[in-house]
C-alpha cells in the first residue's frame, strides 16, 4: 500500500554557486519511526543489482552514527515528521535530483526533490500591475525563488538608479509549499515617472550587488497643460481685449480634444488652443482654464482669474441672524458687487447715518429691543460710489417682561374656597401664547392667563405663574395663606410611660399637627361630660372609676376638630371579693354545693386560692369550688383569695351549713 508514506516539500529548489539551499520537508510513515536515511544525488535504480547507483551525499546508519566528513549536507529532520535538509555551500554540480532514501521498521522509500543551481545569482523578477495610472497607489512586487537561513540576502528598489524613499515590505517563505524572498513596494506614481526605469537589485548581506531586474514605467496620465494670458496680470477695465493660450507639456496616451471653461462651465465653440475675448464686460470676469482630454480623462490647466473692474452696484444688507434674541450678538454685512472691492462703507439705521461705521461688517455684541429697525448701507471703490439699496429689517425678540401673579379673591382665603388668580405681564415679543402654573394641579383655566382653584386645600401654600412666548418668564410665587380648622387632633398619654395602675398620677395631652390661625382653645370630655379646657388633662391619683372613653376638641376661628375617642384603662389588684354559695348557704348532706369567688379586678384574676375555717388552703385553684357529695363535716366558714398581675385580694368569711338527710336521721 503506497499510501503509507506522505511527503510534503517544494518540487524544485533554486540556488547559485556558493549560496546555500534549505529544503523544508515533512513526511509521515504510518508504521513507525525512521530507522535509516541516505541522501543520494541523481539516484539511478540498477535493476540487475537491485541497488541505487549515484552519489551518497549524506548517510545515517541504523545505529544513529553519521560520518564526520558530512559537514556540507545536513539532515535537520527527525524520526517521524521532519525531513528538512540543508546544503551549505551549494555547488553548480549539485544541480539535478536529490533522492531521500528512508527506511522504517516495515518499509523503504525513495523521495525525489529537484535542485537547480546556477553559475551566478539569478535575477529576481519584477511584477507590475497590468496598468499604472498617475496618483493611483500600486504595489510593485519583486520575487526571487530563493531563501536560505545560512545565506542572508536583500532586495533593494531603485528609481533611475536612486534608492526609492518609500518603505518596502520584505517577506520570506521557507515552507513545504514554497521557498521565496519577496519585496513589495507601495508607490503612487506621478505623471513625471512615465518612462522612468525601476530596478529591483539583489544584494548580499553586506549590500554587494548580485543581480537585478529592471522595468520601464508606463504611467498613464491626463494631459498636463500650461496657460498664458495677455495682459499677464489679467486685470482689465470694461471694453478691453484679452488673449489666452493653452500649451500641452505631456500626455499619455495622446490627447484627443481641447476646450475652454469659465467658472467650471464649458465655453461653446471654443475648441482651439487660443481664446480671444474682445471688448470684455464685467460679466466676463471669472476663472478661466483650458481642458485637454485623452483616454485616461481630461486634464485642466491652472486657472487664470480675469478681473474686469467696475464701480459698486446698489447694495443689500444681510443680517446674521434675524429675528435676533435680546442679549445675543448680531452681524450686519453690506453686500455690493464691485471690482476692485469697496474700500469704504456708510451705514444707516432707520434712515439715520450710524456714526463711525465704515467697515463692510457691523457687529453688535449685545442686542437690545431698541436695536430693532431697518438697516441699509452704501459702498464705494476707486471707480465710484454705489446706491443705497432697500435695507433689511432687524426683529429683536425677548421673553415676557415684568410677569406677576395676582390673587383676585378677597382675603383671607379659607380652606374650601374657590380661588381665582391671573398672570399679568408688561411686554413681549413675540406675543404670549400660553401660561404655566406651579405647582401643577387639576385646576381650571377658564381663560388664557387665569387660574381657578375650586375647593382650595389647606396645604395650598404658594402659586407662581409663567407667561410664555418662545421662552417662559416666571413670576415670583404669591402666598395664598389659606386658613383652616386645626388638623390631626389626637389624645396622647404623657405619663406614666408604662401601663396605668390605680393610684398613679396620669397626664393626657391633646395634640394637633397644625392650625391657621394659630390661636386655639381646648375641650376635654368623657361620655359627653366636659372635663377641662387646657391642653392637658391631669389625674393626681387615678382610680378604676376614672377608666373610660376620652375625647379632646381643638377649635380656632375657622372651626373645631375632635380627636378619636381614646380609652383610658386602669389596672388594679382584685377587690370587692366575696364567696357566694349555690344553691345556698344551707345544704343537705349528699347533695352538691358550689362556692364561687366573685371579685372586681383589672386585669381579671388569674389565680384563685381557697381557705377553710382553720385558714388551711384547699387544693383547689379555680374560681368555683364544688363539693359533691357534700358531707356534714364540710360545714364551716370559707374564704377565697384572688391574684392578678397587680396584686392580691381576699374575701370575708362565708359560712356553709350542711345538715343531715332524713335517711341519716331515720337510721339514728
Amino acid at each position: 500500500d503506497s499510501s503509507k508514506w506522505v511527503f510534503e516539500h517544494p518540487e524544485t529548489l533554486y540556488a547559485w554557486e556558493g549560496a546555500c539551499v534549505w529544503i523544508p520537508c515533512t513526511y509521515r510513515a504510518l508504521d513507525g519511526d525512521l530507522e535509516s536515511f541516505i541522501l543520494f544525488h541523481n539516484p539511478e535504480y540498477n535493476k540487475n543489482t537491485s541497488k541505487f547507483d549515484g552519489t551518497r551525499l549524506y548517510e545515517s546508519t541504523k545505529d544513529g552514527k553519521v560520518p564526520s566528513e558530512q559537514k556540507r549536507v545536513q539532515f535537520l529532520g527527525d524520526k517521524n515528521k521532519n525531513c528538512t535538509l540543508s546544503i551549505h555551500p551549494v555547488h553548480l554540480n549539485d544541480s539535478g535530483q536529490l533522492g531521500l532514501r528512508m527506511e522504517s521498521k516495515t518499509e523503504k522509500w525513495m523521495e525525489r526533490i529537484h535542485l537547480n543551481v546556477s553559475e551566478r545569482p539569478f535575477p529576481p523578477h519584477i511584477q507590475l500591475p497590468p496598468e499604472i495610472q498617475e496618483s493611483q497607489e500600486v504595489t510593485l512586487t519583486c520575487l526571487l525563488n530563493f531563501s536560505c537561513y545560512g545565506y542572508p540576502i536583500q532586495l533593494q528598489w531603485l528609481l533611475e538608479g536612486v534608492p526609492m524613499r518609500q518603505a518596502a515590505v520584505t517577506s520570506t517563505s521557507l515552507t513545504i509549499k514554497s521557498v521565496f524572498t519577496r519585496s513589495e513596494l507601495k508607490f503612487s506614481p506621478q505623471w513625471s515617472h512615465h518612462g522612468k526605469i525601476v530596478t529591483c537589485q539583489l544584494q548580499d548581506a553586506d549590500g554587494k550587488f548580485l543581480s537585478n531586474d529592471t522595468v520601464q514605467l508606463n504611467v498613464k496620465h491626463t494631459p498636463k497643460l500650461e496657460i498664458k494670458v495677455t495682459p499677464s496680470d489679467a486685470i482689465v477695465r470694461e471694453g478691453d481685449s484679452v488673449t489666452m493660450t493653452c500649451e500641452v507639456s505631456s500626455s499619455n496616451p495622446e490627447y484627443t480634444t481641447v476646450s475652454w471653461l469659465k467658472d467650471g462651465t464649458s465655453l461653446k465653440k471654443q475648441n482651439t488652443f487660443t481664446l480671444n475675448l474682445r471688448e470684455v464686460t464685467k460679466d466676463q470676469s471669472g476663472k478661466y482654464c483650458c481642458q485637454v482630454s485623452n483616454d485616461v480623462g481630461p486634464g485642466r490647466s491652472e486657472e487664470v482669474f480675469l478681473q474686469v473692474q467696475y464701480a459698486p452696484e446698489p447694495s443689500t444688507v444681510q443680517i446674521l441672524h434675524s429675528p435676533a434674541v435680546e442679549g445675543s450678538q448680531v452681524e450686519f454685512l453690506c453686500m455690493s458687487l464691485a471690482n476692485p472691492l469697496p474700500t469704504n462703507y456708510t451705514w444707516y439705521h432707520n434712515g439715520k447715518e450710524m456714526q463711525g461705521r465704515t467697515e463692510e461688517k457691523v457687529h453688535i455684541p449685545k442686542i437690545l429691543p431698541w436695536h430693532a429697525g431697518t438697516y441699509s448701507c452704501v459702498a464705494e471703490n476707486i471707480l465710484g460710489t454705489g446706491q443705497r439699496g432697500p435695507g433689511a429689517e432687524l426683529d429683536v425678540q425677548y421673553p415676557p417682561k415684568k410677569v406677576t401673579t395676582v390673587i383676585q379673591n378677597p382675603m383671607p382665603i379659607r380652606e374650601g374656597d374657590t380661588v381665582t388668580l391671573s398672570c399679568n405681564y408688561n411686554s413681549s415679543n413675540p406675543s404670549v401664547t400660553r401660561y404655566e402654573w406651579k405647582p401643577h394641579g387639576a385646576w381650571e383655566e377658564p381663560s388664557l392667563g387665569v387660574l381657578k382653584i375650586q375647593n382650595v386645600g389647606w396645604d395650598n401654600t404658594t402659586i407662581a405663574c409663567a407667561a410664555c412666548n418662545s421662552w417662559c418668564s416666571w413670576a415670583s410665587p404669591v402666598a395664598l395663606n389659606v386658613q383652616y380648622a386645626p388638623r390631626d387632633v389626637r389624645v396622647r398619654k404623657i405619663k406614666p410611660l408604662s401601663e396605668i395602675h390605680s393610684g398613679n398620677s396620669v397626664s393626657l395631652q391633646c395634640d394637633f399637627s397644625s392650625s391657621h390661625p394659630k390661636e386655639v382653645q381646648f375641650f376635654w370630655e368623657k361620655n359627653g361630660r366636659l372635663l377641662g379646657k387646657e391642653s392637658q388633662l391631669n389625674f393626681d391619683s387615678i382610680s378604676p372609676e376614672d377608666a373610660g372613653s376620652y375625647s379632646c376638641w381643638v377649635n380656632n376661628s375657622i372651626g373645631q376638630t375632635a380627636s378619636k375617642a381614646w380609652t383610658l384603662e386602669v389596672l388594679y389588684a382584685p377587690r370587692r371579693l366575696r364567696v357566694s354559695m349555690s344553691p345556698g348557704d344551707q345544704v343537705m348532706e349528699g347533695k352538691s354545693a358550689t362556692l364561687t369567688c366573685e371579685s372586681d379586678a383589672n386585669p381579671p384574676v388569674s389565680h384563685y386560692t381557697w381557705f377553710d375555717w382553720n385558714n388551711q388552703s384547699l387544693p383547689y385553684h379555680s374560681q368555683k369550688l364544688r363539693l359533691e357529695p357534700v358531707k356534714v363535716q364540710h360545714s364551716g366558714a370559707y374564704w377565697c383569695q384572688g391574684t392578678n398581675s397587680v396584686g392580691k385580694g381576699r374575701s370575708p368569711l362565708s359560712t356553709l351549713t350542711v345538715y343531715y338527710s332524713p335517711e341519716t336521721i331515720g337510721r339514728r
Epitope: 503506497s2 535504480y45 537491485s50 521498521k105 516495515t106 523503504k108 522509500w109 525513495m110 525525489r112
Partner: nanobody, 128 residues
Framework: QVQLVESGGGVVRPGDSLRLSCTVS????????MGWFRQAPGKEREVVSC????????YYADSVKGRFTISRDNAKNTVYLQMNSLKPEDTAIYYC?????????????????????WGQGTQVTVSS
Amino acid sequence: QVQLVESGGGVVRPGDSLRLSCTVSGFTLDYYVMGWFRQAPGKEREVVSCISSSDGVTYYADSVKGRFTISRDNAKNTVYLQMNSLKPEDTAIYYCAVDKPFYDGGYYYTCPVDFDSWGQGTQVTVSS
C-alpha cells in the same frame, strides 16, 4: 535474528532442471519480499527473481524469463525457484534474500533495494 537456509543446488547437464528451496525464520513482518540472487565467479551479484508475500507479484531478470519460475508457501515461510532448461551460463552460487518492501515515490519495486538478510548460498553447476 533472521535466518535463511537454501537447499536444492547441485551439478546438472545443460537442459536439465533443478528446484531450489529457501526457508526463512525469525522474520516477523506480515508483508515482505523474497528474492533469488546469483553470483558467478569474478562477477557482481545480480538479481534472478523476486516475489512479494501478499499479492504474489513476481519479477524475473531478462536472462531467465520463460525458463525459471518463482513460487512461495507462506504457511511454511518458504520460497522456491524452479529452474528448467538450464544453461552453462546459469552456473553460480544462488543466494536467497528477504526484505521489507521498497517504494520510490509512488512506484513499487518487487525486488527491493539493498536486501538486508541473506542466506549462505547454494552452488548450481551446469556442465556437459
